[in-house]
């Protein structure tokens, strides 16, 4: 996260982190929690990684230096990529984690509400997304969790911003005009939640960018809402019954 | 299976022109940007031009600037290029070749990842 | 423009031996735009590397790419006889998108 702050403990208990296990272990990618034994995040965080026992969920934590190799995480039973997704394409950036035993909710770990399908009319004005990216382009991983927030921005304004890509329906983007306040590398697959009504409600997924937090070059996240019925289907016909967060 | 087939090359005399066509299948072309690479006989490998998915944004090597033309119909799956004043120096065999525009560490990839076989066009008098 | 030099020009080498090519670029770039490609005569260029160190689809495993910023480099652990041509790194980091000389890699 660029232009970001330190985040406290249980402030977005939602979200995880995705690490690797090879010779060494690193995190490359942030989720979120949306059910007991589900997690939401982007597809291209398993490009060239699909084995499922390489990866490593740690949820309810703050501080990556305080893993050590006692710390509790989660092992994946089921990585399912939306069946449209490409590794030559920008669209369809969302994948599903089957968590191999369901976690319990706690004040640092539970999940975040999902929003309604294909929700378009709400207008959300108070936006935040978090994660444990590079700090600066050319940076490096943070300890604490960050947030920073940043205001959406219409469809039509990110495809001026973006002529060499198609910005669709099923994109949501999110920046500051003058730059200065985004997500970065390591941030992929991590959550854009906005509060409306009292409640948060996870609107995207982080995606991809031009660089990081430069000047009219927004953050582009995946619209959840665009993805609902493929988020029931697919944790519904694994579950036989969904224990998802919808919103109430 | 993604395929890629130029046409339109041949013998032309400097000063004037020549349309290449590339027709594309195997894969949803209105949702990629498209290039044409040119190779002269002998030499290595040169970028001519690229068009967006949508054909509002193109770009050119200044060698060519001013003198050709890229464009698409995404309803025929086809990709253009319009070659007028043609010199000596643009003769070489044109690839036309789709834009791999994924995404890695939330940023976009960009490469080349399918070629057609080429096309040979020979500016000569 | 963004420069792409690649060293050496040729390299001869026997079936098995290591290959190690080189590509040096005139300024920053962005590892998800570089790209290695192989050419054989008569044939179109086969996408090898991509993200500076990503095999394309079918690549085999000999084939491994490295390098950040300015210095990019593509190895052959073995070399089997069909790998013998030309290789070639490219950016599309910044129009225009540029390739380098080539590196010929013959059999000794």
């Known amino acids: 996260i660029v232009g970001g702050t330190n985040s406290s403990w249980g402030e977005w208990p939602w979200q995880v982190s995705l690490q690797v296990k090879l010779t060494a272990q690193r995190h490359l990618c942030g989720g979120s929690l949306i059910g007991h034994q589900w997690v939401l995040t982007a597809a291209h965080c398993f490009d060239g990684l699909p084995l499922q026992d390489v990866w490593r969920i740690y949820s309810g934590i703050l501080n990556l230096s305080d893993i050590t190799k006692d710390t509790p995480f989660s092992q994946i039973k089921e990585i399912i990529i939306h069946q449209n997704y490409k590794v030559s394409e920008g669209n369809h950036d969302i994948a599903l984690i089957k968590l191999q035993a369901p976690l319990n909710y706690t004040e640092f770990q539970k999940p975040i509400c999902l929003p309604s399908k294909g929700d378009t009319s709400t207008i959300y004005t108070n936006c935040w997304v978090t994660g444990w990216g590079f700090s600066k382009e050319k940076g490096e991983i943070q300890n604490i969790l960050q947030k920073v927030n940043i205001p959406l921005v219409t469809n039509e304004e990110c495809q001026k911003r973006y002529q060499d890509y198609k910005i669709t329906q099923r994109m949501v983007c999110a920046g500051y005009k003058e730059g200065g306040k985004d997500a970065c590398k390591g941030d992929s697959g991590g959550p854009l939640v906005c509060k409306h009504n009292g409640m948060w409600r996870l609107v995207g997924i982080t995606s991809w960018g031009e660089g990081c937090a430069r000047r009219e070059q927004p953050g582009v996240y995946t619209k959840v809402a665009e993805y609902m019925d493929w988020i029931l289907e697919k944790t519904q016909s694994s579950d036989g019954k969904a224990q998802m967060q919808s919103p109430a | 299976e993604v395929q890629l087939l130029e046409s339109g090359g041949g013998l032309v005399q400097p000063g004037g022109s020549l349309r290449l066509s590339c027709a594309a299948s195997?894969?949803?072309?209105?949702?990629?940007?498209m290039q044409w690479v040119r190779q002269a006989p002998g030499k290595g490998l040169q970028w001519v031009s690229y068009?967006?998915?949508?054909?509002?944004?193109?770009g050119y090597a200044d060698s060519v600037k001013g003198r050709f033309t890229i464009s698409r119909d995404n309803s025929k799956n086809t990709l253009y290029l319009q070659m007028n004043s043609l010199r000596a120096e643009d003769t070489a065999v044109y690839y036309c070749?789709?834009?791999?525009?994924?995404?890695?560490?939330?940023?976009?990839?960009?490469?080349?990842?399918?070629w057609g076989q080429g096309t040979l066009v020979t500016v000569s008098s | 423009d963004i420069q792409m030099t690649q060293s050496p020009g040729t390299l001869s080498l026997s079936p098995g031996e290591r290959a190690t090519l080189s590509c040096r670029t005139s300024?920053?770039?962005?590892?998800?735009?570089l790209a290695w490609y192989q050419q054989t005569p008569g044939q179109a260029p086969r996408l090898l590397i991509y993200?500076?160190?990503s095999r394309a689809t079918g690549i085999p495993d000999r084939f491994s790419g490295t390098g950040y910023g300015t210095d990019f480099t593509l190895t052959i652990s073995r070399l089997e006889p069909e790998d013998y041509g030309t290789y070639y790194c490219?950016?599309?980091?910044?129009?225009?998108?540029?390739f380098g000389q080539g590196t010929r890699v013959e059999i000794k």
């Open positions: 195997g894969f949803t072309f209105s949702n990629y940007t």
């Open positions: 070749a789709r834009v791999a525009r994924g995404i890695a560490a939330r940023s976009r990839t960009s490469y080349f990842d399918y």
């Open positions: 490219q950016q599309s980091s910044r129009t225009p998108w540029t």
């Open positions: 068009i967006s998915p949508s054909g509002g944004y193109t």
């Open positions: 993200g500076a160190s």
């Open positions: 300024q920053f770039v962005n590892s998800n735009y």
